[in-house]
Amino acid sequence: QNASRGRRQRRMHPNVSQGCQGGCATCSDYNGCLSCKPRLFFALERIGMKQIGVCLSSCPSGYYGTRYPDINKCTKCKADCDTCFNKNFCTKCKSGFYLHLGKCLDNCPEGLEANNHTMECVSIVHCEVSEWNPWSPCTKKGKTCGFKRGTETRVREIIQHPSAKGNLCPPTNETRKCTVQRKKCQKGERGKKGRERKRKKPNKGESKEAIPDSKSLESSKEIPEQRENKQQQKKRKVQDKQKSVSVSTVH
């Protein structure tokens, strides 16, 4: 902490400000600081069997500051709370507890999941995928000519990766058989890869059976309608980025 502490003074008079060190406004030999200079917080520090007053520029971890007209003082957070905003709301929980809306919980409420990195209860994020891209041209061994039966593929992107409890992503690749009117390869066409040519319409009489690519078969659970909106995700990223610098406290 960036604390300026008022040391105990060898003085007989408990309410004399002259000679008080650090941030003390008034002090006594036995009790340390009795009051603090403006803007500093008064806190009681236990030393052995007795408590002495100290003046701090910010409250230590586990305490929150309250500013009153006559005194600024540090008050202890709840037992399960490491740092807090005030007596009602925690900003960081003690080890083994998860923060949810200012509360410290040993288990996250239903519909939320524990993030063991930030030690918070967070919304479950489900997989989100884009629309399918158009089918690729019908190809065989990388060629678009010189055959009758081939395959065509289409892909889609993962827009949102799921969180631990979220629905897994459906296949992102799909392949199906297709047929073309057999035609000879032209001189320049030989070996031309399918992706190099755009196909406007589906081929006449092509097979409709689609085979999901085994590589991308994670799961085909549905994507629920309720998702975190993009702005919420952006804000969460900003917050998480800042938390990773070091965990937020509010003193």
């Epitope: 949810h100 800042q242 937020s248 509010v250």
Partner: antibody
Framework: QVQLQQSGAELVRPGVSVKISCKGS????????IHWVKQSHAKSLEWIGV????????SYNQKFKGKATMTVDKSSSTAYMELARLTSEDSAIYYC????????????????WGAGTSVTVSS | DIVLTQSPASLTVSLGQRATISCRAS??????????MHWYQQKPGQPPKLLIY???NLESGVPARFSGSGSRTDFTLTIDPVEADDAATYYC?????????FGGGTKLEIK
């Protein structure tokens, strides 16, 4: 879209109480907290307090303790604030505002505001 | 309470020029790598609207002409270039410490 709809203007006599409402729509109400803010000519904007819609835990600005009481009804996605023993000092526009998404109060800045409820105290 | 002092109280800027609004906090609003200062715009008869959060992050849908900077006790909202629609009162607000507090506002007029 995300909206906070506040109840209509109130003209009340000194000494009585008034309860104003704020209904959230277009988002999951219990994922966010609700703040109440007072705007008067004399004092610009003043934060009254915040309530977690999920738990109903409230925290008040010391200045408004005993004056304001915040409650929430999850079933109707509505937050309420009751102002007691009204005086001319309480004449102002009262806004409800949604706190940004986050578990720590440090992140509960005001990202969506209601249109405001005008309260006039006059005999 | 943390007192936020905005300056100037009012400001007149020519269309297309830069407007700079300052907000000074009586205590630091930084805590362990975070800066809990935010900026709002309010037009007559309307509620305030969030422009900048956590000192420098632009809220979704807010034009990039608006930017925020600063840390600890000194903060700046910059509008560059100013447009006619930017005529409003601007407020800074902190939530580093209970209670949350607002600045007194800066009224921006466009000529």
């Amino acid at each position: 879209q995300v909206q906070l709809q506040q109840s209509g203007a109130e003209l009340v006599r000194p000494g009585v109480s008034v309860k104003i409402s704020c209904k959230g729509s277009g988002y999951t109400f219990t994922d966010y907290v609700i703040h109440w803010v007072k705007q008067s000519h004399a004092k610009s904007l003043e934060w009254i307090g915040v309530i977690t819609t999920y738990y109903g835990d409230a925290s008040y600005n010391q200045k408004f303790k005993g004056k304001a009481t915040m409650t929430v009804d999850k079933s109707s996605s509505t937050a309420y604030m009751e102002l007691a023993r009204l005086t001319s000092e309480d004449s102002a526009i009262y806004y409800c505002a949604r706190g940004a998404y986050g578990n720590s109060p440090s992140y509960w800045y005001f990202d969506v505001w209601g249109a405001g409820t005008s309260v006039t105290v006059s005999s | 309470d943390i007192v936020l002092t905005q300056s100037p109280a009012s400001l007149t800027v020519s269309l297309g020029q830069r407007a700079t609004i300052s907000c000074r906090a009586s205590e630091s609003v930084d805590s362990y790598g975070n800066t809990f200062m935010h900026w709002y715009q309010q037009k007559p008869g309307q509620p305030p609207k969030l422009l900048i959060y956590l000192a420098s992050n632009l809220e979704s849908g807010v034009p990039a002409r608006f930017s925020g900077s600063g840390s600890r006790t000194d903060f700046t909202l910059t509008i560059d270039p100013v447009e006619a629609d930017d005529a409003a009162t601007y407020y800074c607000q902190q939530n580093n410490e209970d209670p949350y507090t607002f600045g007194g506002g800066t009224k921006l007029e466009i000529k």
